[in-house]
Each structure stands twice: as C-alpha cells, then as structure tokens.
C-alpha cells in the first residue's frame, strides 16, 4: 500500500545544475531503507508523456544525470522520482519546473595568472559546457550568455584593491611593486540572469627587479 505521505519515502526531489550539467537529486524519507529503489522519468514542459531515463531505473543511489535529456536551452523540463521500498510501498515526487538557463549556477572560471616585474597578467580560459552546437562543438558559457563578463580584483594591501572587468579574456594589472605578493580574484558575472560565480583565486608574486643588480 502507498504510504500516507510520500515524504515518508522520498524528500527534496530537485535539479542541481552547475555549468549546465543537470543532476537530479533526492533524499530518502524517514521510512526509506538502503534497499529502497528509485526510478526516474522526465518530460519537456508542455508534453503529456513521461520518458523513463535509461540507466536510472530501480537504482539505489540518490542522483541521476539528466544533462543530455535536459540540454535544450530554450525548453523547460520536469523530472519525477518513484521510490519503491522493499515492502512494496511506493511514492512519487516531481521537481519544480526546471530551466537550465535560469537555474544553473556558475563554477569559478579557469584562469592563468602570470607574474611579471611590475604587472600581473590574468588570462581567462573560456568555460566549456556539456551542450553541443549543431556542428558538434561544445558551447562555452560565452556562447550562451551574451552579457557574460569577467570581474577581476587584485588585492594590493589591506585597504586598496585594483579592479578590472570586461568581456575580453586577457587582462593586466600594471604599476605594481616588484617582488611583492598579491591576491587576485576573478569571477564570472551574468547580470541579466543575476548570476555570479564563486571566485577563482590566485596568489602571485611580482618578479624581482634585476635591472639594479
């Protein structure tokens, strides 16, 4: 028989999305046991039929990768999990409506920080996503978000920071003291979607000035 409350077997069914990798996760409820099995289905918003996700039927783990199945940026999706306990009790719970553009979070960028004598160069590498273009290439975050820009900060001392920002990939902080340590932080910002990545941080030291030796 079905439990009085589905949350006895199943809780917190939701998408967790980062850089467009879309993972469905859930928790077992208080009456869930290690031998409870879970089956996952998904559908596009507006469609009637649910589709069973291959590789996520009668599984015991509490996550399922739906990146490929939810990879169309212009579509909205639902997923649902059905839990069946060893005793034959079952419960089904559905996610809220999911939009990868809206809900994905941004990981810190991949950055190379290069020390020079009186400057520090920062080169941001475009972030790939699992989404494929028509020509088979993987899209980068820059291909998806027109308004994406990088915010760079260099902590010079406790009271002074230098800032740079833009849509370029190469930046340089000039006018620095040789042989001095600095802390750089670089974030990805997408204002139209109110997105901001966690910062990439690099601790770098300018090179000593050998011209006087």
């Amino acid at each position: 028989h079905a439990p009085e409350d589905p949350s006895d077997l199943l809780q917190h069914v939701k998408f967790q999305s980062s850089n467009f990798e879309n993972i469905l996760t859930w928790d077992s409820g208080p009456e869930g046991t290690p031998d409870t099995v879970y089956s996952i289905e998904y559908k596009t918003y507006g469609e009637r039929d649910w589709v069973a996700k291959k590789g996520c039927q009668r599984i015991t783990r509490k996550s399922c990768n739906l990146t490929v199945e939810t990879g169309n940026l212009t579509e909205l999706y639902y997923a649902r999990v059905t839990a069946v306990s060893a005793g034959g009790r079952s419960a089904t719970k559905m996610t809220d409506r999911f939009s990868s553009l809206q809900h994905t979070t941004l990981k810190p960028p991949d950055v190379t920080c290069i020390s020079k004598v009186r400057s520090i160069q920062m080169i941001v590498h475009p972030t790939p996503t699992p989404i494929r273009a028509g020509d088979g290439h993987r899209l980068t975050l820059e291909d998806i978000f027109h308004d994406l820009f990088y915010h760079l900060e260099l902590q010079v001392n406790r009271t002074y920071q230098m800032h740079l920002g833009g849509k370029q990939r190469e930046y340089e902080f000039f006018g620095l003291t040789p042989d001095t340590e600095f802390l750089g932080t670089i974030m990805i910002c997408v204002p139209t979607w109110a997105k901001e990545s966690a910062p990439y941080m690099c601790r770098v030291k300018t090179l000593p000035d050998r011209t006087w030796t």
Partner: antibody, heavy 117, light 107 residues
Framework: EVQLVESGGGLVQPGGSLRLSCAAS????????MYWVRQAPGKGLEFVSV????????HYVESVKGRFTISTDNAKNTLFLQMNSLKSEDTAVYYC??????????WGQGTQVTVSS | DIQMTQSPSSLSASLGDRVTITCQAS??????LAWYQQKPGQAPNLLIY???RLQTGVPSRFSGSRSGTSFTLTISGVEAEDLATYYC?????????FGQGTKVELK
Amino acid sequence: EVQLVESGGGLVQPGGSLRLSCAASGFTFSSSWMYWVRQAPGKGLEFVSVINTRSGITHYVESVKGRFTISTDNAKNTLFLQMNSLKSEDTAVYYCATRIQGLIDYWGQGTQVTVSS
Amino acid sequence: DIQMTQSPSSLSASLGDRVTITCQASQSISSMLAWYQQKPGQAPNLLIYGASRLQTGVPSRFSGSRSGTSFTLTISGVEAEDLATYYCLQDYSWPLTFGQGTKVELK
C-alpha cells in the same frame, strides 16, 4: 584583416519586407557574436539584434520583436536580417558589427533602408 | 532597458582645448562602458573600453574615467581630426544602449 560588407538595403513600402546580408571575412565567423545596429537619419545609434553564430542564441530590441529575424549561414560566413512588416521608423542605415576579443570593434560600412510610400 | 544620458548634446571647441563629455547610466553597469567616435558617412570607431582603457591605435589625448554610474570622456587637446560625434555605449546588458551623442564642432 577583418571585413564586414552589408548589402540588401533599398526603398520599400510600409508593410513590406527586406533581407539584409553581411558578408564576413578575416576572423572565425562560426564562433562569434554578430550584431545589427541602425542609425536613423540625423539620429543616434541603436542595437537591433544579436546572434551567437555557434549556439544560435538571439536577442532583439523590443521595437523589432516579431518583425525582424536574425540568422547566419556559417558555411558562407554570412549574417542576415530578415525585416518584415516594415514601418517608416525603420528607415535607417543598418550596420553589421562583430565582437572580437570581447570588444565590438569591427563594423561594416552600412546599407541604407528607406521605408516610404 | 538601461538608459544612458549623455551631455552635452553639442559643444564648440578651439584647437588645443580640453573637452569633457559625460554619460550617466540609469543603473549600475560596473565598468562595462565604451566610447565611440563617428564621423559623417562612416561607421563608429572604438576609442575607449572598460570605461578607461584606450583601444590600440587611439591617440593618448583620449582618456576615460568612471565614478559610480557616471562616466567621462576627455580629449586633452582637441585636434582638427577629432571633430566628430561621440557616443557612449553600455555593454553591461542587452539591449546594449548608446547615449544620444555629443557633436564636437570647431569654435
């Protein structure tokens, strides 16, 4: 050398259609943001539309939504703007432009579109 | 949409004058502002990006600065070839929007 060459402008009646083209060379067209920008006679500049040539993602200014369609032919390195239901206020010089290394620094010479009866 | 209010709409300058043009954004746009120069019958030409960074090949008499949501383009000593219309552009969010333009004429 980056080159953008627009064509397809002309005189059209209100309610009519026109298709602008922009032939691009000198950069990797198939992974870029491409723009249409217009300038009405004696007026300022206005961004009309943008497309990412790899993802196909597009954006439009509100005044042209539902009437204009931006597209590309990546095999021919060409950007298009299909303009339907044209109004007199669409009269302008239309420029194509591209973003290279983060900067909108390359523009075509422009093509004149006149909407008049 | 983000509004860019540019002033003055026109100004008269003598050769060698210091000229200042300002743009006020209707909301925060970080440093995502560019300045363009346009001469009659030509496409715009990028002068400054990132509010204060000089584009390659642009004379050093052009400079840009930012204070909050207010941005300034300065020409430290106007030359004859600088007589043109100048536009600011916010590159923060779509739709990208220009200021109304400032026409710099000879006094």
